[in-house]
């Protein structure tokens, strides 16, 4: 519903808003102030999201996908401005969105793109598939499709495996690499463009350690200082590696400055967790704690991956015995 | 992290103006609508203004319209609030906030306080 | 201007207790909804948004409900840490409004 009386027609303008899934976001639209406003915002020019005239909301014909979803800033009409706030915004929300106002002396389109993206947070694992190591970079839902790059030992890798699964609303990314019998250091790069978001996973392999029974062993786990930041909420997690699977030793929340400990033969140094190194002590070895045992630091931006392998040997003593 | 840290509050007359700053880390800031909250002495809180991503669009409730100005540099990751003509009831600690999933981030806030 | 009203200023409980904060929207607000926590000589957090979604981080002890005009925040088991205000908040339309609070104390 337009005014009939004579009025100018003031061409199109648009721009991009970026949105982040389930967040609120504002499709701004502004206009030369008049009498009897009528505001249309409609997607890709066929559904209807939001009618204003008369002075107050009509939304008898609301596309049903934006009910209770959108509203105007009622008292700044007047002033020229017709932006929507919008909320909740889904990948489905993607697209050209028009506003249309017209007052007794003109009509004004304004085009606004809305680019929705998604980056839950990544996370890099290690896994032993049989006799083969593999690390492992993930992203459960990402949008659009991100740039995955690995380097090993800062160098760039050119074969880049990546297993995608596509759902209605984003992609599931995992891209493994094959690191068997490599003491090289690794790093996977997760970028989306859109949101200008970048995760890193860094993987370092230390060396072998051999320790006799009943000893303890001090395993180092100290961030590199390009990633971590220690104003940043992160969680450390010291596990170790038996028949395939990880149990959790211990692990530490920097966020309340919590430290968990399910082995009591594990110690942790409070001083150096306030200098960020989170090494930590096994006492009184056995020849079961012979493994790998792998110290994570991970955050929303990076993980980091410290992995130490302990050969645990029977001693003089209990070798003597036999 | 995602920071905000306030500053510029202080001691005004009524009818006078200061300029409160916001700098904001952690975040893509250009992608962001931003708003400033205030919280009055005896605890209430009201939603001051806000202004879009671009920064070309601001939003504002009666009570601070024609007085206060949101604006921001998006090259500084930096968000501001201009208040003119400052009455007494604008005393208030004024919080910077992030418009995410609501009100989702926030500042340690600047103090305000209008006093002849 | 929708008006968010908490009726009770003050809330008394014990630690493990499960207590609801109520707030009242003057005209119905959908499930635009959200929670804030203010600690002592701290900002607010926001605990749930769209009445009943908890926030990244927030304990499962929370638990957002309610859509129209009567909203609740449970805390399932109340724990000394969560002496706090708890203020509700409307963006159904603006002006975006708050509750006046709700201050949970621990006996």
């Known amino acids: 519903i337009f005014p009939l009386a004579f009025f100018i027609y003031v061409p199109m303008n648009e721009q991009i808003v970026i949105g982040r899934l389930d967040e609120d976001i504002i499709l701004p639209s502004s206009f030369e102030r008049g009498s009897e406003v009528v505001i249309h915002w409609k997607y890709q020019d066929s559904y209807k999201v939001h009618s204003y005239y008369k002075g107050s909301d009509h939304l008898e014909s609301q596309d049903p996908r934006y009910a209770n979803r959108t509203s105007l800033f009622y008292n700044e009409i007047q002033n020229g401005n017709a932006s929507l706030f919008f909320r909740r915004v889904s990948l489905l929300d993607e697209g050209i969105y028009t506003c249309y106002v017209g007052t007794a002396i003109q009509v004004i389109t304004n085009k606004v793109v809305l680019k929705v993206g998604v980056f839950l947070t990544p996370v890099m694992k290690y896994e032993k598939r049989n006799t083969n190591s593999f690390l492992i970079c993930s992203v459960l839902s990402v949008y659009p499709r991100p740039i995955i790059t690995w380097k090993m030992d800062n160098t760039p890798i050119s074969e880049n495996n990546m297993e995608e699964t596509g759902s209605l609303d984003s992609f599931s990314i995992n891209s493994p690499l094959n690191i068997t019998g490599s003491n090289s250091s690794y790093e996977c790069t997760i970028e989306n463009s859109l949101l200008k978001q970048t995760w890193t996973g860094r993987w370092t392999m230390k060396d072998g350690l051999h320790k006799m029974q009943s000893e303890h062993v001090s395993l180092s786990c100290q961030p590199v200082n390009d990633y971590f930041s220690p104003n940043q909420d992160f969680k450390v997690t010291w596990s170790r590696m038996k028949s395939g699977t990880f149990s959790v030793l211990a692990y530490y929340l920097s966020s309340s400055q919590n430290t968990i400990i399910n082995e009591s033969r594990f110690s942790w140094n409070k001083e150096l967790i306030n200098q960020s190194d989170f090494s930590m002590n096994l006492m009184d070895l056995n020849l079961s704690d012979s493994g790998e045992y792998l110290c994570n630091i991970s955050s929303d931006e990076y993980t980091l991956l410290t992995i130490h392998t302990v050969h645990v040997e029977p001693s003089q003593e209990t070798a003597s015995h036999n | 992290e995602v920071m905000l840290v306030e500053s510029g509050g202080g001691l005004v007359k009524p009818g006078g103006s200061l300029k409160l700053s916001c700098a904001v880390s952690g975040l893509t800031f250009s992608s962001y609508a931003m708003s400033w909250v205030r919280q009055t002495p005896e605890k209430r809180l009201e939603w001051v203004a806000t202004i879009s991503s671009g920064g070309s669009h601001t939003y504002y409730p009666d009570s601070v319209k024609g007085r206060f100005i949101i604006s921001r540099d998006n090259a500084k990751n930096t968000l501001y609030l201009q208040m003119n003509s400052l009455r007494s009831e604008d005393t208030a600690m004024y919080y910077c906030t992030r418009l995410g999933r609501a009100f989702d981030y926030w500042g340690q806030g600047t103090t305000l306080t209008v006093s002849s | 201007d929708i008006v968010m009203t908490q009726s009770h200023k003050f809330m008394s409980t014990s630690v493990g207790d499960r207590v609801s904060i109520t707030c009242k929207a003057s005209q119905d607000v959908s499930t635009a909804v959200a929670w804030y926590q203010q600690k002592p000589g701290q900002s607010p957090k926001v605990l749930i948004y769209?009445?009943?979604t908890r926030h990244t981080g927030v304990p499962d002890r929370f638990t957002g409900s309610g859509s129209g005009t009567d909203f609740t925040l449970t805390i399932s088991s109340v724990q000394a840490e969560d002496l706090a205000l708890y203020y509700c908040?409307?963006?159904?339309?603006?002006?975006?409004?708050f509750g006046g609070g709700t201050k949970l104390e621990i006996k």
């Open positions: 769209w009445a009943s």
């Open positions: 908040q409307q963006d159904y339309s603006t002006p975006w409004t």
